[in-house]
C-alpha cells in the first residue's frame, strides 16, 4: 500500500465559508456535544460552556462560566503548578445526563470536580461533586468519557501527580473501577470511549458493554525503552464488582492489542490518537475507525485503520489469555496462557448461559473466575483491522482526530469518507477509489495552523456539517464545498461523493442537502470528466 | 517468598549525594508500584515517592521533589533512591515498601540507615 | 495535603484489656464507598508491618484480635486482647490522595 498522495485541492482558510465561534478571553474549546434534536451545540471551554446554534455556531445562545476562586488559585500554585495556565478550570466533562441537563466536569485547579448543568436556566445547579477519577486534575493528562443510562464511564488518572490510572463508573449503587496495578493500566494515555448495544432479540441474552482504547506502556514486550502499545479494552455494562474478590472492581475487565502495521515495510502504527465509532443501518456490526502515529515519528506519519467490532468481540469472547510469569526470582515475563481457563468464562459478560447456571450478577461468580481475570486482564490475542492493513498511510502530517461518514453515491456505491484534522489546524477529506486511498479536499480550519483538539459530525440528514475545535475557538464546516467547483469537469475531477453537477443550473450541488430529484445529474467517482 | 532486601547503612558528609538500593525476590517485580518512605529519628514515617519498575516513570511528594530520584534496574530487579546535597536533616531510615493491588504498603524492606555529619 | 491525626499519642492497656486507637483525616479518604486507610505496626529496630487494609480488611497471618473500623475521616483500630507482643508503635495511613500520609503515631504499652 502506497503512501496517500498529497490532496487534490487545498481550500485556504479565506476561500471558502466558514462558520466560526470563539470568546474573547477564553481558550480550550476542546469539549463539544451535539444535540440533533435540539439543533444545539455545546462547548466546553476553559472555565466556560456555551451554548450555539448548531446550524450557525456564531449565534451563541446561552453562557455559563465556572471560575476558579483565588483562594483555591493559591492553594494549587503553593503544590508548583502554573497560576497562569495550570490552576484553572478546564472543562473536560462534558455529558448528556437528561433533556434538560448536562453533567460536567472541570480540572477546578487540580481538584477535579464535577455539576449539572440546567438547560432550561442554563445555570450549575451547584453540586460540585468530587471529580476524582472522573475527570483528570491536570489538564495535560489525558482523559475520556462516556454517558450510559445516566451512569459516567470515564477513563483518567485519578491522583494529583496523574500516576494512578483509573477506568471507572460513576454510579450511585454500583460504583466500579480498575484494579491500581500495572498489569490491568501501565500509563495509559485514554484516547476514546463508547458504548456498544446489544440487540434487544440478541439469542444469547447478552449485555451492552462500554469500550475503551488508548495507548499504554507495554508490559508484554521487553526492550530498552518503552514500548507503546495501542489497547482497546471493554467493560460489561451489567457488571457489578465481585463478593469478596474485586469487591467493587471490574470483574468484565479486558484488554487487548490494536494492530495498524504495514507487514510488507515494517511500519508500525503503534500511538492510539483517535477513535470513531461508524454506525450506519447498512452495517450488521458497527466499524470503528482508528487514527495512529509511529512511537518514533520523526517523518510526520499517520495510518488509519478500520476494525470490525466482531473482531474485537470475538478476541474477548474466545481467545487466549496472557500470563505474568516470574523468572531467575523475580523477573517477569508474560507469555500465552494455555492452561485450564475456568467456568464461567473471566471477563465475560453475564449471558443467558451463565443465568442458566445460576450466575445470574458478577456478584454470583466463583472465585477461581474473579481471581483468574484479575491476574489475567491482557488478552494474547489481537485486533487485526479489515483487510489486515490500513486504510490510509500519509507522510508529512500528524493528524489529529477522526470522524467518518457513510454516504452513497450516485451510482449507489456506499463511500466510507473520513474527514481526518492535523496538528496544523487542516482538515483532509479521504475516500478509497479502485483500491486506493485519495485524499480528495483539504481546508484550512484555523488561520492560525494550531491543532485541531475535537471533531464532530451532525448526523442529521439535511443540513451536515463537521465541527472542529481548537485552543482558540470552533470551526464549522461544511461535508463538501460543491460550490466552489466552478465548471462540469471540476465538479467531476472533484471525486466528491457528496457532489454532483446540474447541467440544468450549470451548477456543482450538494447531494443529500435537498429533497430535488437526482435524475440528470452527473458525478463520475471514477473522475472521467468526459461525460461532461 | 516475598522479600526487599536493602543496601547497608551508610555515613555521608555534608553536600554529598547517597544512593540507597532495593533488590526484590520471590514476586513479579513488574507488576507492582515501588515506594519509599523515610523515618527521620524518634519520627514518624513520611511517604517520599513511587516507581513504576515497567516505565521508569516516578513520581514524588512535592517536599523530595530536587531531593530524591527514584529509578529502577528491571534486569536486576532492583530499585534505587538517590539523595542529593544531603544535610543533616536528611538523616533518616530510610524504607521501601511494594504497594499492593488494594493500595496499601503489604512488604517491607528492612530499612537502611543513612547519617549525614561532618 | 490530608493530614492524619491519631489519639492518643500514648496509651498503656493491661495485658488481655482492649485497646483503642483512634485516627482523624482532615478530610474524607473515602472514594465510591471505599475507605483508603491502613494500619501499621512497628517494632523498636524494625519495619512498619501491615495489620489493616482499606479500613477493616485484615491482612493474612495478623492475628484476628487485631480489627479496624470507620469511614469518611474517623477511623479505629482495635486489639481486643492485648498480648505482650503487640507492645509497638501503631500508625494509620491514607491512600485516598498523594502525597500519602500517616498519623504521627500511638505508641502502646502494657500497664
Known amino acids: 500500500m502506497a503512501f496517500a498522495p498529497i490532496p487534490r485541492i487545498t481550500w485556504e482558510h479565506r476561500e471558502v465559508h466558514l462558520v466560526q465561534f470563539h470568546e474573547p478571553d477564553i481558550y480550550n474549546y476542546s469539549a463539544l456535544l451535539l444535540s440533533e434534536d435540539k439543533d444545539t451545540l455545546y462547548i466546553g471551554a476553559r472555565e466556560a460552556v456555551f451554548a450555539v446554534n448548531a446550524l450557525n455556531i456564531s449565534e451563541k445562545q446561552h453562557e455559563v462560566y465556572w471560575k476558579v476562586s483565588e483562594d483555591k488559585k493559591a492553594k494549587c500554585a503553593e503544590k508548583g503548578k502554573s497560576k497562569q495556565t495550570e490552576c484553572l478550570n478546564y472543562i473536560r466533562v462534558l455529558q448528556p445526563l437528561s433533556a434538560t441537563s448536562l453533567y460536567v466536569c472541570g480540572t477546578n485547579a487540580f481538584q477535579p470536580a464535577c455539576d449539572h448543568l440546567n438547560l432550561t436556566s442554563f445555570k450549575f445547579l451547584g453540586k460540585n461533586e468530587d471529580g476524582k477519577g472522573r475527570c483528570p486534575f491536570d489538564p495535560a493528562h489525558s482523559y475520556t468519557s462516556v454517558m450510559v443510562d445516566g451512569e459516567l464511564y470515564s477513563g483518567t488518572s485519578y491522583n494529583f501527580l496523574g500516576s494512578e490510572p483509573i477506568i471507572s463508573r460513576n454510579s450511585s449503587h454500583s460504583p466500579l473501577r480498575t484494579e491500581y496495578a500495572i498489569p490491568w493500566l501501565n500509563e495509559p494515555s485514554f484516547v476514546f470511549a463508547d458504548v456498544i448495544r446489544k440487540s434487544p432479540d440478541s439469542p444469547d441474552g447478552e449485555d451492552d458493554r462500554v469500550y475503551f482504547f488508548f495507548t499504554e506502556v507495554s508490559v508484554e514486550y521487553e526492550f530498552v525503552f518503552r514500548v507503546l502499545i495501542p489497547r482497546i479494552a471493554r467493560v460489561c455494562k451489567g457488571d457489578q464488582g465481585g463478593l469478596r474478590t474485586l469487591q467493587k472492581k471490574w470483574t468484565s475487565f479486558l484488554k487487548a492489542r490494536l494492530i495498524c502495521s504495514r507487514p510488507d515495510s515494517g511500519l508500525v502504527f503503534n500511538v492510539l490518537r483517535d477513535v470513531f465509532v461508524l454506525r450506519s443501518p447498512g452495517l450488521k456490526v458497527p466499524v470503528f475507525y482508528a487514527l495512529f502515529t509511529p512511537q518514533l515519528n520523526n517523518v510526520g506519519l499517520s495510518a488509519v485503520c478500520a476494525y470490525n467490532l466482531s473482531t474485537a468481540e470475538e478476541v474477548f469472547s474466545h481467545g487466549k489469555y496472557m500470563q505474568s510469569t516470574t523468572v531467575e526470582q523475580s523477573h517477569t515475563k508474560w507469555v500465552r496462557y494455555n492452561g485450564p481457563v475456568p467456568k464461567p468464562r473471566p471477563g465475560a459478560c453475564i449471558d443467558s448461559e451463565a443465568r442458566a447456571a445460576n450466575y445470574t450478577s458478577s456478584l454470583n461468580l466463583p472465585d477461581k473466575t474473579l481471581q483468574f481475570v484479575k491476574d489475567h486482564p491482557l488478552m494474547d490475542d489481537s485486533v487485526t483491522p479489515i483487510d489486515n492493513r490500513p486504510r490510509l498511510i500519509k507522510k508529512d502530517v500528524n493528524y489529529t482526530q477522526i470522524v467518518v461518514d457513510r454516504t452513497q453515491a450516485l451510482d449507489g456505491t456506499v463511500y466510507d469518507v473520513m474527514f481526518v484534522s492535523t496538528d496544523r489546524g487542516a482538515l483532509h477529506k479521504a475516500i478509497s477509489l479502485e483500491h486506493a486511498v485519495h485524499i480528495i479536499e483539504e481546508t484550512q480550519l484555523f488561520q492560525d495552523f494550531e491543532p485541531v483538539q475535537t471533531l464532530l459530525l451532525s448526523s442529521k440528514k439535511g443540513n451536515r456539517f463537521v465541527y472542529a475545535g481548537s485552543n482558540s475557538g470552533v470551526v464549522q464546516a461544511p461535508l463538501a464545498f460543491c460550490g466552489k467547483h466552478g465548471t462540469c469537469e471540476d465538479c467531476v475531477l472533484a471525486r466528491d461523493p457528496y457532489c454532483a453537477w446540474s447541467p440544468p443550473t450549470a451548477t456543482c450541488v450538494a447531494l443529500h442537502q435537498t429533497e430535488s430529484p437526482s435524475r440528470g445529474l452527473i458525478q463520475e467517482m471514477s473522475g472521467d470528466a468526459s461525460v461532461c | 517468598q516475598v522479600q526487599l532486601v536493602q543496601s547497608g547503612a551508610e555515613v555521608k558528609k555534608p553536600g554529598s549525594s547517597v544512593k540507597v538500593s532495593c533488590k526484590a525476590s520471590?514476586?513479579?517485580?513488574?507488576?507492582?508500584?515501588m515506594h519509599w518512605v523515610r523515618q527521620a529519628p524518634g519520627q514518624g514515617l513520611e511517604w517520599m515517592g513511587q516507581i513504576n519498575p515497567t516505565t521508569g516513570g516516578a513520581s514524588y511528594n512535592q517536599k523530595f521533589k530536587g531531593k530524591a530520584t527514584i529509578t529502577v534496574d528491571k534486569s536486576t530487579s532492583t530499585a534505587y533512591m538517590e539523595l542529593s546535597s544531603l544535610r543533616s536533616e536528611d538523616t533518616a531510615v530510610y524504607y521501601c515498601?511494594?504497594?499492593?493491588?488494594?493500595?496499601?504498603?503489604?512488604?517491607w524492606g528492612q530499612g537502611t540507615t543513612v547519617t549525614v555529619s561532618s | 495535603d490530608i493530614v492524619m491525626t491519631q489519639s492518643p499519642d500514648s496509651l498503656a492497656v493491661s495485658l488481655g484489656e482492649r485497646a483503642t486507637i483512634n485516627c482523624k483525616a482532615s478530610?474524607?479518604?473515602?472514594?465510591?464507598?471505599?475507605?483508603?486507610m491502613n494500619w501499621y505496626q512497628q517494632k523498636p529496630g524494625q519495619p512498619p508491618k501491615l495489620l489493616i487494609y482499606?479500613?477493616?480488611n485484615l491482612e493474612s497471618g495478623v492475628p484476628d484480635r487485631f480489627s479496624g473500623s470507620g469511614s469518611g475521616t474517623d477511623f479505629t483500630l482495635t486489639i481486643s486482647s492485648l498480648q505482650a507482643e503487640d507492645v509497638a508503635v501503631y500508625y494509620c495511613q491514607q491512600s485516598n490522595e498523594d502525597p500519602y500520609t500517616f498519623g504521627q503515631g500511638t505508641k502502646l504499652e502494657i500497664k
Open positions: 478530610q474524607s479518604v473515602d472514594y465510591d464507598g471505599d475507605s483508603y
Open positions: 515498601a511494594r504497594y499492593y493491588y488494594g493500595r496499601h504498603f503489604d512488604v
Open positions: 482499606a479500613a477493616s
Open positions: 520471590g514476586y513479579s517485580f513488574s507488576d507492582y508500584y
